[in-house]
């Protein structure tokens, strides 16, 4: 039994880091493998993660972490019974994938303006809380070409757009994702999408 693709890990910078790797053949990850992880920290203790299958030869493990600070460094040991298959380390602050924003809502009752709001996925005491920026994706269910991205570079989790920038009388969907420049993170997953019917009053033409 050998590791074909070494574990790579990303952290949500809160409580979970996710590590993925591939074995050289079909493996029952949860029965055959264990990933031990330990904070490099005087008198810390090792924790065991039981991996799950992620495709035939792929494994994934969700490492539970008690908060994250920038100095954190973990040792990782991948075991198959008594055999050490791989040894490595992981610094969560250097491999951050933020949590996805939630509770995306489209408010259509503001005069001819669409107000999109969502929730910051972090609590106020987390470092990322004040460092997230967002991308909002809006697309038409009827017209695949009608697809747009709005970059929200301010901290407030909201976006205002004129309803007239979208076509009237058709349904749209929106979703939002986040990233943090300070840790050069990857983008989060997209939030669940929300749907609304776009309608607005066309301005009267003057003759």
């Amino acid at each position: 039994m050998k590791v074909l693709q070494e574990p790579t890990c990303v952290s949500d910078y809160m409580s979970i880091s996710t590590c993925e790797w591939k074995m050289n053949g079909p493996t029952n990850c949860s029965t055959e493998l264990r990933l031990l992880y330990q904070l490099v920290f005087l008198l810390s203790e090792a924790h065991t993660c039981i991996p799950e299958n992620n495709g035939g030869a792929g494994c994934v493990c969700h490492l539970l972490m008690d908060d994250v600070v920038s100095a954190d460094n973990y040792t990782l040991d991948l075991w198959a019974g008594q055999q050490l298959l791989w040894k490595g380390s992981f610094k969560p602050s250097e491999h951050v994938k933020p949590r996805a924003p939630g509770n995306l809502t489209v408010h259509t009752n503001v005069s001819d303006t669409l107000l999109l709001t969502w929730s910051n996925p972090y609590p106020p005491d987390n470092y990322l809380y004040n460092h997230l920026t967002y991308a909002v994706n809006i697309w038409s269910e009827n017209d695949p070409a009608d697809f747009r991205i709005y970059n929200v570079t301010y901290l407030e989790p909201s976006l205002r757009i004129a309803a007239s920038t979208l076509k009237s009388g058709i349904s749209y969907r929106a979703r939002v994702r986040a990233w943090a420049q300070c840790y050069n993170t990857t983008w989060s997953e997209w939030s669940p999408s929300t749907k609304w019917h776009n309608s607005y009053r066309e301005p009267f033409e003057q003759h």
Epitope: L39, F41, L42, L43, S44, E45, D67, V69, A71, D72
Partner: antibody, heavy 120, light 108 residues
Framework: EVQLLESGGGLVQPGGSLRLSCAAS????????MHWVRQAPGKGLEYVSG????????YYANSVKGRFTISRDNPKNTLFLQMSSLRAEDTAVYYC?????????????WGQGTTVTVSS | EIVLTQSPGTLSLSPGERATLSCRAS???????LAWYQQKPGQAPRLLIY???RRATGIPDRFSGSGSGTDFTLTISRLEPEDFAVYYC?????????FGQGTKLEIK
């Protein structure tokens, strides 16, 4: 209420021995790394020793290595420091402290201290 | 072994003023954790800041920590009468624990 209560301090002659105890209440000792920190009269804080939550791994400052032994009795929720070959420079208030991994080495709970005096 | 040096040894200020206490490590400590404690006469120390910049439970927001590498700072934005005490920095690393020698913050 979370509390640590040290006992066992006193006056001892150079070369003598003493055993300090620390009774924990309001939390489970086995969930935390536990440490001893001391403070000589009019001086600053000095780290002495620590022990991991369950594996029993220990660490000692160079100044006490080979003379002091830290141990714990998790079922009794008690931490110990066995001190031998005591020297005048070991005279101090000894504090029992808790370290929460979440606090990354920050010692969030301290006992009131027990005084050890090494003198002839 | 890493040595922590605190400065100044004594800081004389008045209530309402801003206090800046320094802690310098003898070598870079990128994978270690810096904490700050307050100690009043006859009392055990109290944890103020851990992980360089995070306030411990119940600590007022006038206390803040910052720094990286070798230089760390504890700032008290607006001194209250109860803040006059001795302050210690502490480094908790992979293989050692070290305290600074302390800074005494006294009323001017």
């Amino acid at each position: 209420e979370v509390q640590l209560l040290e006992s066992g301090g006193g006056l001892v002659q150079p070369g003598g021995s003493l055993r300090l105890s620390c009774a924990a209440s309001g939390f489970t000792l086995s969930s935390y790394a536990m440490h001893w920190v001391r403070q000589a009269p009019g001086k600053g804080l000095e780290y002495v020793s620590g022990i991991s939550p369950t594996s029993g791994s220990t660490y000692y400052a160079n100044s006490v290595k080979g003379r002091f032994t830290i141990s714990r009795d998790n079922p009794k929720n008690t931490l110990f420091l066995q001190m031998s070959s005591l020297r005048a420079e070991d005279t101090a208030v000894y504090y029992c402290v808790r370290v929460k991994v979440r606090y990354r080495g920050g010692m969030d709970v301290w006992g009131q201290g027990t005084t050890v005096t090494v003198s002839s | 072994e890493i040595v922590l040096t605190q400065s100044p040894g004594t800081l004389s200020l008045s209530p309402g003023e801003r206090a800046t206490l320094s802690c310098r490590a003898s070598q870079s400590v990128s994978s270690a954790y810096l904490a700050w404690y307050q100690q009043k006469p006859g009392q055990a120390p109290r944890l103020l800041i851990y992980g360089t910049s995070r306030r411990a439970t119940g600590i007022p927001d006038r206390f803040s920590g910052s720094g990286s590498g070798t230089d760390f700072t504890l700032t008290i934005s607006r001194l209250e009468p109860e803040d006059f005490a001795v302050y210690y920095c502490q480094l908790y690393g992979a293989s050692s624990v070290t305290f600074g020698q302390g800074t005494k913050l006294e009323i001017k």
